[in-house]
């Protein structure tokens, strides 16, 4: 199982039989009327995972996903006709694909779905109390939900649902080219980015939505939006991709005589993740494929993560880059894209700008205006003409924290979970790719928490048949990691100690900050336990130092390689 | 109560237009397709047009296409086709239906007579 | 020419039992569902089957439809006076993207 080496090589593989006969994996192989399980919510208080998916969202047990619910929501044979009608594939386009699945209140959840081209939210009761046991579709209640969900199965829809309101980035009509971010739900009219105008969106693909605080007043809290769009012309040479971060003021209302029913607030940055190339042209990863907030103990300042992949068909390479909400707020308040000069390139606008400075959240924190409704025209003007910021954001240390180009996969979605070793705190990332395995790297610092070192812990096939992986939640309370793709949903442990061996070196060697050996096994590492001594170095993983001799004795050459 | 009402038919010169309204009632216009079928002096029905709730997709039959179009406010709660380089074989009675994976409901027509 | 096949006319007496037929193809009857419309003398037409064999609320259940293969057909049992109408059968022709009608059958109701 364990193999010493190079970083980018695995310390262990296994594959999915090997994953099923040492218990690693349970997985719900779908239904045959199902598929597409794209969808996830994670509750750790009631102990479940709600999973939309085509015609149906279920309700598995984290304990074990064997153990599930389900409530099947088709659409009418009257709405699969018409999408039929309409030259979609009635088995791939013209079913309910579950797109939205947010928690609404104690109560109830909020989804949507793609209705067969025809978008419909409801509401699923849920109780009050895990041990209610409801899940229960509100059949008498369903909303239109163009805005909310798309029309096309293969689009993604970015949502988040806050205080009753749900912003969603999505594309918001059958053909799939008026995509906006939206407010609905709530008691105020419906808030969309500008339609038809390519400086604000230029067919984006939404990722992910998050609320931020930025300051200890909540008037202030933003919505930032993740997402990858066309390049602008001009901004490059060619067709190119890049990866993007939205925001909007949580109290944005739109205008009063412009922009009217429109986010004021809304600007959006680059997201550079790169590495120097020959020539000293840099290779971008510009195909932002999912991001990861890690929380730290400022709420202001969580850690971004982001998986990327290039967008070259010749040289296939995912990376993964970290940002910084500090580095982030600096370019939203450094200076706006423009268009000027004789070839009408963008420059960083060096006019004078309004104040409020737009982008600004109407506050007490950051001067005097209680609404963007009372925002002075020449505020509103400038931000509808100058959405972009020209600076783009790199991520912490310029470069990213690892790539993977020499591999016939690509990288698609990712977790973090924060586990505390021996040696300090640890970042283990879960990587997932397109070919159904999962990644698990651990960030180590090496001189300073900038520079760090990936290793490669393990690399683990979930799913019987390659298949992208789609989405991936980690339970902390349960220990356990859920993944999903088109096929079904799997749920595998966060840590396989034992598996890293019989002797304390190996286990030593590993560098896994889950494991640590206890003397007799490698086991899980608990840093509130009173064990008398747990061998475990995760920064250099250096046994000789760590394990007695009787740990060491004759096993240092003695590795066991699965492929 | 579900009500389709069309208006706009009369006689027409060959190579004349028209335009055809139909103003709906009774339900949720905006989640509808809609659709206009045909029927000449003494024929049979032909489906002419259809349209998607949210305008998105639009189909004709090959004998009108290039020259009807068909589209729909929405906020109005009207259904439009309109009717150009008419023929003498576009002779007909037009009818606006509802459409809900078949024709539901009918309005009562409006004749159209292209004379040469 | 119909896309959809129907025989021009059918008659019964009342209290009999009537079939209309309808046939296709594939790319219509084969692969879509089939909906009957009625079509009372200088009336629009009415929606009376849909998909294949179900009735909208109001009509009466003398009238029921039947598909097999590419074809269908439509009974109406205990024939009444007031039956008397065009019938047509339509689908949605894959094939050609567009809805498709038969010819229609005259339904008369004798004595």
């Known amino acids: 199982n364990y193999q010493n080496g190079k970083n980018n090589v695995p310390r262990l593989k296994l594959s999915y039989k090997e994953m099923l006969e040492s218990n690693n994996v349970i997985t719900f192989n779908g239904l045959a009327n199902s598929s597409s399980y794209h969808t996830f919510l994670l509750d750790e208080e009631r102990s479940r995972l709600y999973v939309g998916a085509k015609d149906h969202i279920f309700s598995f047990n984290l304990v074990n996903i064997k153990d599930f619910q389900k409530i099947v929501w088709p659409v009418s044979y009257t709405r699969r006709d018409e999408c039929k009608w309409a030259g979609k594939d009635i088995l791939k386009e013209c079913a309910n694909f579950i797109k939205v699945l947010k928690a609404y209140n104690q109560t109830h959840l909020y989804a949507c779905g793609t209705g067969a081209f025809h978008p419909i939210c409801t509401y699923i009761e849920i109780g009050h109390h895990p041990e209610d046991n409801i899940f229960k579709l509100e059949d008498s209640h369903f909303e239109n939900g163009r805005g909310k969900s798309p029309y096309d199965p293969k689009l993604l829809t970015a949502s988040l649902l806050i205080d009753g309101e749900l912003y969603s980035g999505t594309a918001a009509d059958f053909m799939g080219r008026d995509f906006a971010i939206f407010r609905t739900l709530g008691h105020h009219h419906p808030i969309r980015t500008e339609q038809h105008d390519s400086r604000w969106l230029n067919d984006p693909r939404f990722i992910s939505a998050h609320l931020i605080p930025e300051s200890d007043n909540p008037e202030d809290d933003k919505v930032y939006f993740f997402f990858r769009e066309n390049a602008i012309d001009g901004e490059h040479t060619g067709k190119a991709t890049h990866a993007r971060i939205g925001q909007i003021c949580k109290n944005d209302f739109g205008g009063h005589r412009s922009l009217v029913n429109k986010w004021t607030t809304f600007l959006k940055a680059r997201l550079i993740c790169s590495v120097p190339g020959p020539n000293g042209i840099d290779t971008h990863f510009d195909e932002l494929q999912d991001v990861f907030l890690m929380n730290s103990k400022d709420p202001k300042n969580p850690v971004v993560y982001g998986v990327f992949t290039t967008s070259s068909n010749i040289f296939k390479g995912s990376a993964v880059c970290m940002y910084s909400m500090s580095d982030v707020r600096r370019v939203f308040l450094g200076p706006y894209a423009h268009r000027d000069g004789p070839n009408y390139q963008w420059v960083p606008y060096q006019g004078r700008v309004p104040y409020p400075r737009p982008g600004t959240c109407p506050s007490k924190t950051f001067g005097g205006f209680d609404s963007t409704k009372d925002l002075p025209d020449d505020v509103i003007t400038f931000a509808r003409s100058h959405p972009a910021m020209y600076n783009p954001v790199f991520p912490i240390n310029n470069r990213p924290i690892m790539i993977k180009t020499d591999v016939n996969y690509q990288f698609t979605q990712i977790v973090v979970d924060r586990v505390d070793a021996e040696d300090g705190q640890y970042d283990v990332m879960f990587i997932g790719t397109d070919v159904g395995t999962v990644l698990k790297v651990v960030s180590i610092p090496k001189e300073t928490w900038h520079d760090l070192e990936e290793v490669l812990l393990e690399e683990m096939t979930v799913f019987r048949e390659p298949t992208t992986i789609s989405a991936m939640e980690l339970s902390t309370k349960q220990q356990q990691l859920y993944v999903g793709s088109a096929a079904g949903v799997a749920q595998l442990p966060l840590h396989r100690c034992d598996i890293y061996g019989k002797a304390c070196a190996e286990c030593c060697l590993a560098r896994d900050p889950y494991c640590a050996w206890d003397g007799s096994s490698c086991s899980r590492y608990f840093p509130t336990a009173k064990a008398r001594t747990r061998a475990q170095d995760i920064r250099n993983g250096d046994p000789l130092t760590h394990c007695s001799d009787g740990g060491i004795e004759g096993r240092m050459d003695h590795h066991h390689h699965h492929h | 109560e579900v009500q389709l009402l069309e208006s706009g038919g009369g006689l027409v010169q060959t190579g004349g237009s028209l335009r055809l309204s139909c103003a709906a009632s009774g339900f949720t216009f905006s989640d509808y397709a809609m659709s206009w079928v045909r029927q000449a002096p003494g024929k049979g029905l032909e489906w002419v047009s259809w349209i998607y709730y949210d305008s998105g997709s639009k189909y004709y039959a090959d004998s009108v296409k290039g020259r009807f179009t068909i589209s729909r406010d929405n906020s109005k709660n009207t259904l439009y086709l309109q009717m150009n380089s008419l023929r003498a074989e576009d002779t007909a009675v037009y009818y606006c239906?509802?459409?809900?994976?078949?024709?539901?409901?009918w309005g009562q027509g409006t004749l159209v007579t292209v004379s040469s | 020419q119909s896309v959809l096949t129907q025989p021009p006319s059918a008659s019964g007496t009342p209290g009999q039992r009537v079939t209309i037929s309808c046939s296709g193809s594939s790319s219509n009857i084969g692969n879509n569902d089939v909906s009957w419309y009625q079509q009372l003398p200088g009336t629009a037409p009415k929606l009376l089957i849909y998909a294949d064999s179900h009735r909208p609320s109001g009509v009466p259940d003398r009238f029921s439809g039947s598909k097999s293969g590419t074809s269908a057909s439509l009974a109406i049992s205990g024939l009444r006076s007031e039956d008397e109408a065009d019938y047509y059968c339509?689908?949605?022709?894959?094939?050609?993207?567009?809805?498709?009608f038969g010819g229609g059958t005259k339904l008369t109701v004798l004595g």
């Open positions: 239906a509802k459409l809900n994976g078949d024709f539901d409901y």
């Open positions: 339509g689908a949605w022709d894959s094939s050609l993207s567009g809805y498709v």
